[in-house]
Every structure is written in structure tokens, then in C-alpha cells.
Amino acid sequence: DNKGYCAQYRGEVCNAVLAKDALVFLNTSYADPEEAQELLVHTAWNELKVVSPVCRPAAEALLCNHIFQECSPGVVPTPIPICREYCLAVKELFCAKEWLVMEEKTHRGLYRSEMHLLSVPECSKLPSMHWDPTACARL
């Protein structure tokens, strides 16, 4: 449900990862979108502390660009999803081992909350950069 508004990213966690002065989509299904989305990222980043040095920067970029999606220019506030190819590169190339562990934990119900699920995109559901190069964001 893409109900929300666009605003400059004013948080801290993703500041070094997002494009400079990024205008991001804030989802109004949360009472306080900025705070809720920042908390989502913060929680997920803590789990990334244990991943490999190869995986971590790629995962951080994926995470921040998924939770704080860039706004698309236009008369209705619309988030730009990550391109499927970039998501798959993180899942199958940079973080293959970690992604498998995470999926295993999810199946076995080992996560204390559902929060991490919101911060991990389903790559297969994302648009391909080959369909329309402007319809998705490149990491």
C-alpha cells in the first residue's frame, strides 16, 4: 500500500548509504513514519554486525534503499523500488551464505519479531531494470 509522503532523509543510520540529500518515501501506515522506518533499519543493522565484510556493505545498501525508497518525481508520492538485479546480486553473490541462514531461521521461527521480515525485500517481486530503467533504483 503506497500511501505516504516524500521528505528529505533526516535520519542517521542510512545517511552514508543513501544518495546525498535523498528525498525518500515515508509510509503513512506507520503513525510516525520517520521514526518507525529508522527503527526498522536500526534493528536490522544490528543483526548485520555479525555478517562477513563482503556481505555487510551490500546488505546495508539494500536495506537502506528498501526501507527508505527514493521518491519518484510526479504529482502523487510514489516510492521507487530497488531493481531486481541488484537485490539478486546481494542475495546470491555478496550475501549468499548469510541469506540462507536468515531464510532457515525464518522457517524455523527463530526470530523474536517480524520486524526483520519487513526490512528484507523479496527479490522476485521487484521490477527488472530491463523492463523500464527508470522504474527501479540501482544500488
Epitope: 509522503y5 540529500d21 528525498l23
Partner: antibody
Framework: QVHLVQSGAEVKKPGASVKVSCKAS????????MHWVRQAPGQGLEWMGW????????SYAQKFQGRVTMTRDTSISTAYMELSRLISDDTAVYYC???????????WGQGTMVTVSS | SYVLTQPPSVSVAPGQTARITCGGN??????VHWYQQKPGQAPVLVVY???DRPSGIPERFSGSNSGNTATLTISRVEAGDEADYYC???????????FGTGTKVTVL
């Protein structure tokens, strides 16, 4: 067609207040921050502050803190800027402006001339 | 507070190139936007995010940004380009938006 239409010119006495309106059309009003910018005669552009039309949250330039109030009425897609304790230096054209999915101001109102004179 | 400095005026002959600078501390780390304003009119965005152009703005308008200086370049200048030009940034630390001092471009 995207438009920001502002209220008409005002003449005020020093010490009075002025309230300028900015009616948005052609886009989702609550989806983008509304900014207010002023320009004194022969001078440059000066940012005054913004309002988030969705939440009503505001941020004001330090210079106007305590003297400016920005509000909105989402039912009529209108933003307001009220400036109190007017002095002659507040004589200026006041603009509302917004950015539709970009971080710059790509739509502007036509401007409202406010003259402060005794 | 963050300060943006522009030259007060730039003169250029028709068909030549005008370059307007905007100086600010580490401005290269910020997104810079440029506005054109003609007398009695509201400003018009001509370049945003350093170098992007809104639809309807001629390719003659281009921007760059690095270090402590951002530049708006108007190539093949026309008489209709005569106007005031302002740079603008968002200062993240104060959450304030800042305009440059403005540059008057005169076409000779």
C-alpha cells in the same frame, strides 16, 4: 495542471500580523512539503520555513522563529503562513513553493506582495 | 549557519558561454539546485541535484558540483537568458534551506 495560487496583496501597519494563503491543485497536497520563501524589493531569495502538510510538522528559519506560524487545511489543500509583529523590513513578496518528488522547488506560487507601512 | 556566495554579476555576449559559481564549505557533499528569476516573476527551477534538468529546460543549461564550488553553465547564451540566478542547498545539520546571494546575468 499543477498550480499554487496565493492570496492577494496586503498592506499592513507596523506591529500588525499578516496571513498569506497558498492553494494547491493538480497534485497530492499531503505528499510533499510546502516551503515559504520571501524576497524584499531588490534583494535575494530568503527561505522562511516548511510545513509537512501530512502531519502539520514545521521547521522555521532561525530568523523568523517565534514570529512565523505555518499551518495547513488538508480539506481544501491550502497552506498558510502568518507573520506577526511586522516591521518595515518585512515588506516583501512572499512565495509558497514545493518539490514534487525532487528535493528542489519545482513549483512556485505567483507571490503575494506584503507592504508594511505606517 | 551555512553560507552560499555568488558573484553579483556576470556579463556575456550572445552565443557565448556564461558560468555562474556558487561557493560553500564542502558544497560538493550537498545537492545543489539552480533557479532563474526574471523581473516581476516567480523563480523557475533550471537545474536540480547538481546537474539534472527539469522537463522544458533547454540542454544549454547544465550544472556541476565538487569541492567548495558548484557551477551553472549556460551555453550559447540568448537574450532571453538575461535574469537573476540563485543557487540553493539543504543544510542537513540545521535542517534549513539556504539560497545563494544571487547573480545578475546580463547579455551584452
Amino acid at each position: 495542471q499543477v498550480h499554487l495560487v496565493q492570496s492577494g496583496a496586503e498592506v499592513k501597519k507596523p506591529g500588525a500580523s499578516v496571513k498569506v494563503s497558498c492553494k494547491a491543485s493538480g497534485y497530492t497536497f499531503t505528499g510533499y512539503y510546502m516551503h515559504w520563501v520571501r524576497q524584499a524589493p531588490g534583494q535575494g531569495l530568503e527561505w522562511m520555513g516548511w510545513i509537512n502538510p501530512y502531519s502539520g510538522g514545521t521547521s522555521y528559519a532561525q530568523k523568523f522563529q517565534g514570529r512565523v506560524t505555518m499551518t495547513r487545511d488538508t480539506s481544501i489543500s491550502t497552506a498558510y503562513m502568518e507573520l506577526s509583529r511586522l516591521i518595515s523590513d518585512d515588506t516583501a513578496v512572499y512565495y509558497c513553493a514545493s518539490g514534487l518528488g525532487i528535493s528542489a522547488f519545482d513549483i512556485w506560487g505567483q507571490g503575494t506582495m506584503v507592504t508594511v507601512s505606517s | 549557519s551555512y553560507v552560499l556566495t555568488q558573484p553579483p554579476s556576470v556579463s556575456v555576449a550572445p552565443g557565448q558561454t556564461a558560468r555562474i559559481t556558487c561557493g560553500g564549505n564542502n558544497i560538493g557533499s550537498k545537492s545543489v539546485h539552480w533557479y532563474q528569476q526574471k523581473p516581476g516573476q516567480a523563480p523557475v527551477l533550471v537545474v536540480y541535484d547538481d546537474s539534472d534538468r527539469p522537463s522544458g529546460i533547454p540542454e544549454r543549461f547544465s550544472g556541476s558540483n565538487s569541492g567548495n564550488t558548484a557551477t551553472l553553465t549556460i551555453s550559447r547564451v540568448e537574450a532571453g537568458d538575461e535574469a537573476d540566478y540563485y543557487c540553493q542547498v539543504w543544510d542537513r545539520s540545521s535542517d534549513h534551506y539556504v539560497f545563494g546571494t544571487g547573480t545578475k546575468v546580463t547579455v551584452l
